[in-house]
């Protein structure tokens, strides 16, 4: 048999081999695709097939308009006229391209020796669902799950099921002071056509940087509550990406999973101390915080801390 | 909104014709086929003809072929029954349909429009 | 040509019944069968297309069903607008082919 590709939407014409071209003709077309359960046998009247395979005066099967529902396989036996019968025998395949994949949300720069998203990879409307590479500097990157890792996604139209390719690229540069240039390919797999390419992206690596500072924010200010009350201490920090941060009191750890956000409801006088947060950054080492203090009091023990106010917005008086 | 409206028909004598119009909106005319159905009183349906989208190809039912023929105007989204040579048999209520081939079958339906042949 | 034998012709049933009409091809006709519903004085009106898909705007009671060449349509609580004729189609092959009707009448 014949291995046939067409493209959505064409039309496609099989020829039915030794058929006299006109008639008195003796053929007979059947097709097994998406359309059919088992092989349906065209009238050579005509019928409502006509609209998805109709058999034209010369015996030759004519597709006005490819779809998925007609790949499959394509059968015609005739005699010709001296008698003999000869089959064709047409495996057709279909296929789309896409519009022109894109890098969307593409990073702005990178950081060396952490992971950095460099962006997402998008093609839509591509019949079969074909593949998304990435390059680097115009050489063809192998994700490897440590240093360079993709993430894809392959999503059917459920009306015209046709697909859309979503491939997000994570890698993490060796070295700052680089401008590695960024692109993705799709390619349909069919031969005699070629990948299509994305505009390149080219990013800046820059060294990570030490954080610039570390501050430990109180609520309420001034770190004084009343027994009962909450005491929210926040640590501030602006590193990329967010470090993982560990809480002190009194100078020993707290047994506390990583958080920049340490609350601490219905406060007794245990919890009473001073608290700082240390912030450790995969490349720089940990970073402490200045220390606050916390103190527990009943409300009218002493004024209210400068500054601070009541619960209903407006300063107390003793 | 898919519409199908018929008109054209009445009461004629054995022998004459007839010709019946479908006006056609709230869809893409040339991208459907269109098919003729009738309906005798008190009877069931039969199918009279078919088209295909671009008038090319035409279907009928050995009842009515060399007698009718459907024909359309893609321009002015109209479809066309032309009735020759009536009989008595072909009084019925004929519906103008949206479709007839394997990818609609028959989805939408005019309203219909009576044709009587009496003398 | 192919015949669409539809039964029974006429069945008379209360509101809450479980009806079910059968209409069988007399050649395979693949999943290409339409049921239509239709009233007095009204053009008949799609519920399923290809075997067993429900039409737009077609209540979920009304469903269709296939094995070979016989085709089923079947309402599974009937209700007081549900009375009337009901046809089926076959579109695989012309002439195109309509079952001979079902009236659904009040018990």
């Known amino acids: 048999g014949q291995n046939i590709t067409a493209r959505i939407g064409e039309p496609l014409v099989l020829s039915c081999k030794g058929a006299p071209k006109k008639p008195p003709q003796q053929l007979e077309w059947k097709l097994n695709t998406g359309r059919t359960e088992a092989w349906k046998v065209l009238s050579p009247q005509g019928g409502p097939w006509d609209s998805v395979a109709r058999i034209l005066p010369n015996g030759s099967l004519l597709l006005p308009a490819t779809g998925i529902v007609d790949e499959g396989t394509f059968r015609c036996r005739a005699t010709n006229r001296r008698g003999k019968e000869v089959k064709s025998n047409y495996r057709v395949r279909v296929y789309q391209i896409p519009g022109k994949p894109e890098i969307v949300d593409p990073a702005s720069e990178l950081t060396a020796s952490v992971p950095n998203k460099v962006g997402t990879c998008v093609s839509e409307g591509s019949y079969p669902a074909g593949t998304l590479s990435w390059h680097l500097d115009g050489k063809l990157l192998i994700p490897d799950g440590k240093e360079t890792l993709v993430k894809e996604e392959t999503r059917r139209h459920p009306e015209t099921g046709l697909f859309t390719l979503r491939s997000e690229l994570t890698v993490i540069p060796t070295q700052g002071g680089t401008h590695p240039t960024f692109s993705c390919s799709f390619s349909l797999g069919l031969p005699r056509r070629r990948p299509l390419n994305t505009a390149p992206i080219q990013l800046r690596v820059r060294e990570p940087g030490p954080p610039e500072g570390i501050q430990l924010l109180v609520e309420p200010e001034g770190g004084i509550v009343a027994p009962g009350g909450t005491v929210t201490l926040t640590c501030a920090i602006s590193a990329q990406p967010p470090p993982q941060v560990h809480w002190i009191k009194d100078g020993a750890p707290l047994p506390l999973a990583p958080s920049p956000v340490l609350l601490l409801p219905e406060v007794g006088h245990e919890d009473e101390g001073t608290y700082s947060c240390v912030a450790t950054h995969p490349s720089h080492g940990p970073q402490e915080s200045p220390p606050v203090s916390i103190r527990v009091t009943e409300t009218g023990d002493e004024g209210p801390a400068e500054g601070s106010v009541g619960e209903s917005g407006l300063g107390t008086l003793a | 909104e898919v519409q199908l409206v018929e008109s054209g028909g009445g009461l004629v004598q054995p022998g004459s014709s007839l010709r019946l119009s479908c006006a056609a909106s709230g869809f893409t005319f040339n991208n459907y086929w269109m098919t003729w159905v009738r309906q005798a009183p008190g009877k069931g349906l039969e199918w009279v003809a078919s088209?295909?989208?671009?008038?090319?190809?035409?279907y009928y039912p050995d009842s009515v072929k060399d007698r009718f023929t459907i024909s359309r105007d893609n321009a002015k989204n109209s479809l066309y029954l032309q009735m020759n040579s009536l009989r008595a048999e072909d009084t019925a209520v004929y519906y103008c349909a949206r479709g007839g081939d394997i990818t609609t079958g028959l989805d939408y339906w005019g309203q219909g429009t009576l044709v009587t042949v009496s003398s | 040509d192919i015949q669409m034998t539809q039964s029974p012709s006429s069945l008379s049933a209360s509101v809450g019944d479980r009806v079910t009409i059968t209409c069988r091809a007399s050649?395979?006709?693949?999943?290409?069968v339409n049921w239509f519903q239709q009233k007095p004085g009204k053009a008949p009106r799609r519920l399923i297309y290809?075997?067993?898909n429900l039409a737009d705007g077609v209540p979920s009671r009304f469903s269709g069903s296939r094995s070979g060449t016989d085709f089923t349509l079947t309402i599974s609580s009937l209700q007081p607008e549900d009375f009337a004729t009901y046809y089926c189609?076959?579109?695989?092959?012309?002439?195109?082919?309509f079952g001979g009707g079902t009236k659904v009448e009040i018990k």
């Open positions: 050649q395979d006709v693949g999943i290409y």
């Open positions: 189609l076959e579109f695989d092959e012309h002439p195109l082919t």
């Open positions: 290809r075997a067993t």
């Open positions: 088209i295909d989208n671009s008038g090319d190809n035409t």
